[in-house]
């Protein structure tokens, strides 16, 4: 499955929108920074079959979409930017879902992929727990925004590697 070039552009647009969503200076929130334990090893793309990589990417985008689709998120961000950001993520999910269906038919996805998906889910659970503990404060959301920018950039890099494999 070849991810369309528009998918890559959509990923960049999502990152830019996320950058624009910042409402307060990140530098006023330095003390709130947190180690969420991003599962970097799941995104290095070396030990993966293509089907595995795509399903991990899908989980990453799905969890990001879910996080920014909550009521608390709606209250935290400027509505039009949030809607554009969600639309970009939704389009990426559609692209990836089409690929997951195609690729799973080609390769049997081993059990280790479930571990990778679980690692991504636990990562987002830690983010949600942090937001809850910080009572969804503006700084907590700002820290999470920066964290998601980091994780989305890992996703972008994995997608680039997948395209090079094609």
């Amino acid at each position: 499955c070849d991810l369309p070039q528009t998918h890559s552009l959509g990923n960049r647009r999502a990152l830019i929108l996320l950058a624009q969503m910042g409402r307060i200076s990140h530098f006023s929130c330095l003390k709130d920074r947190h180690d969420f334990g991003f599962p970097e090893e799941e995104f290095d793309g070396h030990q993966f079959q293509k089907a595995q990589a795509i399903s991990v990417l899908h989980e990453m985008i799905q969890q990001t979409f879910n996080l920014f689709s909550t009521e608390d998120s709606s209250a935290a961000w400027e509505q039009s930017l949030l809607e554009k950001f969600s639309t970009e993520l939704y389009q990426q999910l559609n692209d990836l879902e089409a690929c997951v269906i195609q690729e799973v038919g080609v390769e049997e996805t081993p059990l280790m992929n479930e571990d990778s998906i679980l690692a991504v889910r636990k990562y987002f659970q830690r983010i949600t727990l942090y937001l809850t503990e910080k009572k969804y404060s503006p700084c907590a959301w700002e820290v999470v925004r920066a964290e998601i920018m980091r994780s989305l950039s890992f996703s972008t890099n994995l997608q680039k590697r997948l395209r090079r494999k094609d």
Epitope: L15, I16, L30, R33, M149, R150
Partner: antibody, heavy 120, light 111 residues
Framework: QVQLQESGTVLARPGASVKMSCKAS????????MHWVKQRPGQGLEWIGV????????TYNQKFKDKAKLTAVTSANTAYMELSSLTNEDSAVYFC?????????????WGQGTTVTVSS | DIVLTQSPASLAVSLGQRATISCRAS??????????MHWYQQKPGQTPKLLIY???NLESGVPARFSGSGSGTDFTLNIHPVEEEDAATYYC?????????FGSGTKLEIK
Amino acid sequence: QVQLQESGTVLARPGASVKMSCKASGYSFTTYWMHWVKQRPGQGLEWIGVIYPGNGDTTYNQKFKDKAKLTAVTSANTAYMELSSLTNEDSAVYFCTRNYKYDYYTMDYWGQGTTVTVSS
Amino acid sequence: DIVLTQSPASLAVSLGQRATISCRASKSVSTSGHSYMHWYQQKPGQTPKLLIYLASNLESGVPARFSGSGSGTDFTLNIHPVEEEDAATYYCQHSGELPFTFGSGTKLEIK
């Protein structure tokens, strides 16, 4: 590969202003903070400030807030720093540096530096 | 501002031996799982190069003979075994709060 190309050596008079550039290539310019760092001859490093080209957000070291102005033109993938009211103390090498991993605020790629000499 | 005090100011180490550079912050730069201290190497006439980030993480492409440790206010850069190409000035930098500051540098000479 990531490259930061800075403008050349500048000679300026005391009291004047200078504007230096830093052209980025090999990465998404709009999604990385860009720091500026000062190094006087034979001395250590000083952090001046940082700009986010994606939205123009800037943060300065208070020591430099009346001295330096950071801007970026995304269409040209270029960041700029303007130094005003120059004195001998401003004679230094100025580096633009790409921020690493969003909120770690460390610097992974550096330009080759712009040398500013202030002399009457 | 957080002041970073590096020691020693200079040291000479024999080839193959261990070089240890210390960086002490006037205030803690650690918070919630991360220590916001980083290390750079600068060779004469060159730009600084990132070696270690977040106190102990080796930057990609940096040889494994470089290692960092510490938390709170006390941090250490170790180089072992030292090689000739390691002759340089080493700087620590914190990003715990604004403004970010650098240490005054440690010049390493290889004997």
